[in-house]
Each structure stands twice: as C-alpha cells, then as structure tokens.
Amino acid sequence: SQVSQNCHNGSYEISVLMMGNSAFAEPLKNLEDAVNEGLEIVRGRLQNAGLNVTVNATFMYSDGLIHNSGDCRSSTCEGLDLLRKISNAQRMGCVLIGPSCTYSTFQMYLDTELSYPMISAGSFGLSCDYKETLTRLMSPARKLMYFLVNFWKTNDLPFKTYSWSTSYVYKNGTETEDCFWYLNALEASVSYFSHELGFKVVLRQDKEFQDILMDHNRKSNVIIMCGGPEFLYKLKGDRAVAEDIVIILVDLFNDQYFEDNVTAPDYMKNVLVLTLSPGNSLLNSSFSRNLSPTKRDFALAYLNGILLFGHMLKIFLENGENITTPKFAHAFRNLTFEGYDGPVTLDDWGDVDSTMVLLYTSVDTKKYKVLLTYDTHVNKTYPVDMSPTFTWKNSKLPNDITGRGPQ
C-alpha cells in the first residue's frame, strides 16, 4: 500500500523504528543518541553544501514486537501488520530505519511499497538478500558465507596448504540474532556454503559438540560456531581437544580482541576467531560513551543509517530530483558514503561491505594475532602473518579430514 511521506518542501523526516528487544539488547536511549548525533552531522553537511533544508527524525517505539527472550525469532507478523496500519494512517518519513530482525524485515518488505526505502541495522538472514529497497548496515549472513567458502578453498598460504571441504556447525538455538541467522545460512541445504562443501553436519546438543572434540571417527576436524569466548568456554570447558581440531568462532561484532590488555585464555588455542576490523574513533564519541564493545556496531549502524540518508538526500537535492520516487528508494546501493568512522561501502544490493579479520592465539605471547584479512567487497583474502605461532603442528592448519596432512 502506498505510504504518504513527510518528505518535501525543504522538510525531510526519517522514521525510526525503535524496538525494545531488537537484534541486540541495546538500550533505546543509546540508539536515540546515535540517531540524534547522526542528525547533527547531516544538518552540518547539508548546510556546508548550501542546502537550506530541515532534517528530523520521528521515533516510533515498540516494546513487544519481539518477546522477552531478547531474540527476534518470535518476531511475529502481527507486529508488522500493526506497523503497516500505523504507516497507512499517518504520514511517515522519507525513509524507515529499522527493523533489525530478519523475520520483521522480510515481512515488512513484502508489505511495503517499493517506493519506500528501508535501512536496517541487522536483518542478517538470507531471506533479506537481494531486496531492491532494503539497505543493511551490518554484515549479513551472505558475506560470512562467502568468506568461509573462500577460506575453505584456500590452499596456497604458508599456514594453510590444504583445501577444506567439510565442516561441523554447532547450533543449539540459543544464539543471538546475528549468530542465529549466520548459522541458519550455513545450515541451509540450498545455499552457497552447502553447495561448496562435500560434508556438513549440524551439532545441536552440547554433548554432540563435546564428543566430537576427541572422536577418532569424526568426519571433519573443523567446527564452526558463533559467539564469544565465554560462550565457547561454557560449552567446551577445559576438556581435552584432539590436536588437529580447528574451531572457527564467528564473533563479528566484538572489539575486545583488539584491546591492549587482553590475553587469550588457554581454551582459545585451538580457535580461529572471525571478527570485523575495529573502528578507530568510536571510543571517544559522545554517543558511544555508555556502549560496551559488543554494542558499538549496532548503535553505529543506526548512526550510519542517518548519514546514508543525508548522503542520498544531498545528491538528489543537488541534482534537483524528487525524493518521494522509486528512483530514490532504489538508490541506496552500489556506493560509498562518509560514515561516522570513515568510508562505508554498500554493494550492488545495498549490503555493507567490510574487512573481516581472522585471529589466532599466539602460543608465545598468549595474545590474539591477525592471521589474515578478507575484503567482502572483492571477495579476496589477504594473509597478514606468514609464520604464525600456532598450536597446530608445523605451524600449519591441519587438513579438515582426520588422518591426512599434519596431525
């Protein structure tokens, strides 16, 4: 249904959907601060460009679109049904920022006119891929999947001389929203990851995971899981682990590995951590004062959503083009804009590109060290540490199949 928009005559409004238990359990006040900081920057940039317009945000709050579990899986169509009615009963802004939950976004996308752009801090699932008017400012599952396949196939690095074609995936259903969708994508039988692997089994019980660690008959040495080091410790504890096991811990939105005083615990020695390259200016920003390292990315995505809107608004106004058109709604992709923490690149489908970083634990220093980086924009891996001090034999990653390669 066509939505009436507050989006003309020099006055441009952003509708911001604030959901109590969204993709990350971030206090709404922090998100408000991020949005307001973004608005200040946008106003300044427009003024500097000689554009005398007003830009504001209207917040709409939901405290039950998703339930108390703090996840988005129960994010129901009734919440979206309600939001659609509200949208049709009153004028919305030029753009909707939120929702962050995959189920919500997918349903809203089906229910919304394509002339209405949506910017999401989340919506990680594959069901939100390739949506013409949806922009995602946090790495979606597709990007993770492409990294993993690229890394599995790599066999020409000093520390990885074998292509891998197998994996276990640990997924017990208690994951955070980002992890849930990342692992869902890996589990899906019809996906790039599944297509490229010869063997893949999902471990759903703690005991299954624990048994694999020392099982001589295991079908793969590689286990993918998602979460932080504490999550892994709860599961693995101090159990013995076969020396050719490699655990890939996906923990994209966590800066703590890069902090100076962090020492890797002993249980992390068999683990490669996949995370995002950290930002550089957030530590001193006013909006992030109260944010934990794991929450910065979520608030930053809201802020960058505002800056992205400002970027597009500036371009369209300078070209004398109408904002309330399908052209505007479809324009939030295949571009680079000045984000809060540096340039932000969006791919052809409006999904953020980033530098992923694979870390290992140095047996010498007990510190996390960068093994390689991966540029999601060009789907390319760049080795960083050519002679890593691994726990694995000969400082090389083992073959993924037991009984072959360095043991």
Epitope: S62, G79, L82, K85
Partner: nanobody, 119 residues
Framework: EVQLVESGGGLVQAGGSLRLSCAAS????????MGWFRQAPGKEREFVAA????????FYAHSVKGRFTISRDNAKNTVYLQMNSLKPEDTAVYSC????????????WGQGTQVTVSS
C-alpha cells in the same frame, strides 16, 4: 468491520491522568489491531499508540512514550489508553481505530472523545 465508541475524555489539569476506553462491537475483536490517534485543531492527525490483536505487541509515538499505556481486554471487547503526566500539548480529540489482521489499514474509526489539559 467493528463499530467503535470512545469514552473517558474530559478536562484535566496538567500533570493529571485520564483513562480512555474504546468499546468495540463484534465477535472477532481479538483478531483486530487497535490504535489511538489524536487531532488538535488546525493540525494533522497524529499517531499515539497501537496494540496488536493478542496484546503482545505495542507501539508508541515518541511524544507519549513513558507517559501513556495502551492495553486491551479481549473478553470485554475494549481497548484502553491510560494517560499520565498529561501536558497542555496533549489537548486534542482522541479517536480509536481498528483493523482486521491482514488488512493494510485501520478500517474502522470511532467518533472521538475530547481531551483538554489546562495549565
């Protein structure tokens, strides 16, 4: 569509409270999303709060968040708007709206009830 009748409006001093009710006719009330909107003289209609059919999902406008609470009693076919810490700028005609699940709009609207907040 359901018929909607609002009540509970009136004159109240700033800082005071009011509770608006919206009674609905019809046996499928629990499948209807309900909302409260308001319109002050010379201004556009403004969204206030809304609640899903089960009551599990609520939305609030920024201007009323923390002061107003929407709720519903499906056994009584009634939706409520509890308004606390009222301000003069809350003065408006408050209308209740309902829409069947799956329809894109609030298809039913009440006549409205006047709320006046004096300073």
């Amino acid at each position: 569509e359901v018929q909607l009748v609002e009540s509970g409006g009136g004159l109240v001093q700033a800082g005071g409270s009011l509770r608006l009710s919206c009674a609905a006719s019809g046996r499928t009330f629990s499948s209807y999303a309900m909302g409260w909107f308001r319109q002050a003289p010379g201004k556009e209609r403004e969204f206030v709060a809304a609640i899903s059919g089960s009551g599990g999902v609520t939305f609030y406008a920024h201007s009323v968040k923390g002061r107003f609470t929407i709720s519903r009693d499906n056994a009584k076919n009634t939706v409520y708007l509890q308004m606390n810490s009222l301000k003069p700028e809350d003065t408006a005609v408050y209308s209740c709206a309902g829409g069947a699940h799956g329809s894109p709009d609030f298809g039913s609207w009440g006549q409205g009830t006047q709320v006046t907040v004096s300073s």
